[in-house]
């Protein structure tokens, strides 16, 4: 987890660009910016969802332009805009950022908001470094600002996905190392033995690979059928063996007005109630003309502070102000094993072997346009055909010559001959059978099974 | 503009086989699942297999496995079926269609259609 | 496989009406269908995916509706140009298959 922050220096023309100004015969006006963060390592469509989440600043002061006098660079919002993030910083991602004017005259239905200026840039990224600047135009006008992405502890890491604790908490989790006092930075974990399980082993002495509670083994790969003690964090206890209690992402409750916590892998999540987010629930006072509802949430009601809004959210997004991202692939809608992912805009299923189609419910026909050679008939099956090739053939496509005496399917000395319908064994004295695998009992009857009617212990045995 | 375009009409002797053909323009051939589909006359509309141009796999109905045999060829964008063994009941007309490789996707575009009459 | 059942062949209405044309499915199939419109002499054109989303550029008087076995096609203000035979189709499963069609008599 962690938080982008931007800050705007200065919007207004750029060199040699005299627009008019925002604010000519329109009354009084005030400045607004909305960002938001897609994750940019491929190319999203422009009207894809802000995966890494979007903010709205503050309005800025009310400015009405001096008639005749140049357009100066805009009175500006106070304060960063924070956009949280819950999962690992991506590195490389799309900053979009709006400049929105609003319009305080009499308007009739209340203040009027247009776009002003959108611009749009990939990015590479490392959280926790310092402030990047950039300047950018949009059409005749010149934004200037500045950008951060930095985690919030216990995260820590160019991407926020190593975990940290200051030297004071308990010890720290699985392959983590205590940090130094008033560091952010996690001490290199020890190296553990070779192929420690990374997801359920650790270890504090180099060479070593001690178990998380639940699992056991030399390399903690083996699960323990039960234990008392699942669910619980911390460092092991030497008496009971099982895991004391450490410190939670969720003890204290870390969401205001009251939001209620729950905790996730490494982190927390808030779920607010109406009326207030952020990532702890801390943003508050908000009306539909704040913009509270991201990934093109449509917001109805709360005209005014004191009124609640809803946010009715487009399909695949959830939560009081559309913020959550649905995990559509959990209706499972890929068959036969297929694996879902979702790109976004849409989910698509990466088929197993064997099977195609948008949800992988097709069955491939895996002899189609596969012919096998010499007389060889195709068997389909599992996505990978298979020859079965005639006689004295082999190979994958029944091409190669192959002895059908190599393998000696004859028992007990018996000779092998090829013949045109079949393999045929003549025995050995003293045996019988397809592949001369019954003895003869002395009295002329082999053991169990009995031997067809009419066949001689000596006789060619023809090999199904 | 989104345009499959089938081969004309087909007149044929019961016995032997007729290929007929769907050239795709306005999308990228290999992203889309191209489908055949028979239509008797008066009929309903039957399922015949679709092909993938991406990888060249293919999947039939079981009824008309070894009666329809689907390839592509991507460098021309055009899907392929050859109709073997024929007989008075393969007159139908036939149709190309495509179909997105999302998991909502469901056949969204169809050829004109290509008649074929088996007839002595 | 999933037989899709029309069960009217033919359904007769006047320019303006409302109607309705039922189609269903041997077995569930979730929201996995759509509805396909033919006109005399011309191929299919899709008008409804996912049971209920309509394609753009179709007329927003088709509406699809239903879920699992039972789906439902209604035009409301029926225009002289939607005389045509329906047809609904299921395309959860393998192989894929259609209704055997509905036509629209105005």
């Known amino acids: 987890a962690g938080v982008f922050e931007l800050q705007i220096h200065s919007f207004g023309p750029g060199p040699g660009g005299a627009p008019r100004s925002p604010y000519s015969a329109r009354g009084p006006c005030r400045l607004f910016f909305r960002v938001c963060l897609k994750p940019g390592l491929s190319e999203e469509a422009a009207e894809s969802p802000c995966a890494l989440g979007a903010a709205l600043s503050a309005r800025g002061p009310v400015y009405t332009e001096q008639p005749e006098a140049p357009a100066p660079d805009l009175p500006l919002p106070n304060g960063l805009l924070q956009v949280p993030f819950r999962d690992a910083w991506p590195g490389t991602f799309s900053l979009i950022i709006e400049t929105w004017r609003e319009e305080l005259g009499d308007q009739i239905g209340g203040p009027a908001w247009s776009l002003l200026a959108r611009v749009t840039r990939r990015r590479r990224l490392a959280a926790g470094g310092p402030w990047a600047g950039d300047i950018q135009r949009a059409g005749a006008w010149e934004l200037r600002f500045s950008y951060r992405a930095r985690c919030e502890l216990p995260a820590v890491g160019t991407a926020c996905t190593r975990l940290c604790r200051p030297r004071s908490a308990s010890r720290c989790g699985p392959g983590l190392r205590p940090c130094a006092p008033l560091e952010d930075e996690c001490e290199a974990p020890p190296v553990c033995r070779a192929g420690c399980s990374l997801e359920h082993g650790f270890c504090e002495q180099p060479g070593e690979c001690r178990c998380l509670e639940g699992w056991t083994g030399p390399l903690c790969m083996v699960p323990v059928s039960t234990s008392s003690c699942l669910g619980l964090r911390g460092p092991s206890s030497t008496t009971t063996g099982c895991l004391v209690p450490g410190p939670g992402p969720c003890d204290g409750n870390p969401c205001a007005n009251g939001g209620s916590c729950s905790e996730t892998p490494g982190s927390f999540e808030c779920t607010c109630p109406r009326g207030f987010y952020g990532l702890r629930c801390e943003v508050s006072g908000v009306t539909c003309a704040d913009g509270p509802c991201f990934n093109g949430g449509l917001c109805v009601g709360g005209a005014d502070p004191d009124s609640a809004y809803i946010c009715h959210c487009p399909p695949g997004f959830q939560g009081s102000n559309c913020e959550k991202r649905v995990d559509r692939c959990s209706l499972q809608p890929c068959r036969n094993g297929g694996l879902c992912l979702d790109l976004g805009h849409a989910l698509r299923c990466r088929c197993r072997a064997g099977f195609a189609g948008p949800r992988c419910e097709h069955d491939l026909n895996d002899c189609a346009g596969r012919a096998c050679a010499n007389g060889g008939t195709c068997v389909e099956g599992g996505g990978a055909h298979r020859c079965s090739c005639a006689l004295g053939f082999g190979g994958r496509d029944c091409r190669e010559r192959a002895d059908p005496c190599a393998a000696r399917p004859c028992a007990h000395g018996g000779r092998c001959y090829a013949h045109f319908s079949g393999l045929v064994c003549a025995c050995a004295p003293g045996y019988m059978g397809a592949r001369c695998e019954f003895p003869v009992h002395p009295d002329g009857v082999s053991a169990l099974p009995a031997a067809p009617p009419g066949l001689r212990p000596g006789d060619p045995q023809r090999y199904p | 503009e989104v345009h499959l375009q089938q081969s004309g009409p087909v007149l044929v002797k019961p016995g032997p086989s007729v290929k007929i053909s769907c050239k795709a323009s306005g999308f990228t051939f290999t992203d889309y699942y191209m489908h055949w589909v028979k239509q008797s006359h008066g009929k309903s509309l039957e399922w015949i297999g679709l092909v993938y141009p991406y990888n060249g796999d293919i999947s039939y109905n079981q009824k008309f496995k070894g009666k329809a045999t689907l390839t592509v060829d991507t460098s021309s964008s055009t899907a392929y079926m050859e109709l073997n063994s024929l007989t008075s009941e393969d007159s139908a007309v036939y149709y190309c269609?495509?179909?997105?490789?999302?998991?909502?996707?469901?056949?969204?575009?169809w050829g004109q259609g290509t008649s074929v009459t088996v007839s002595s | 496989d999933i037989v899709m059942t029309q069960s009217q062949k033919f359904m007769s209405t006047s320019v303006g009406d409302r109607v309705s044309i039922s189609c269903k499915a041997s077995q569930n199939v979730g929201n996995i269908i759509a509805w396909y419109q033919q006109k005399p002499g011309q191929s299919p054109k899709a008008l409804i995916y996912?049971?209920?989303y309509r394609y753009s550029g179709v007329p927003d008087r088709f509406t699809g509706s239903g879920s699992g076995t039972d789906f439902t096609l209604t035009i409301n203000n029926v225009q002289s140009e939607d005389l045509a035979e329906y047809f609904c189709q299921q395309y959860s499963d393998s192989p894929y298959t259609f209704g055997s069609g509905t036509k629209l008599e105005i």
């Open positions: 996912l049971a209920s």
């Open positions: 269609a495509r179909q997105g490789n999302y998991v909502n996707n469901a056949i969204d575009y």
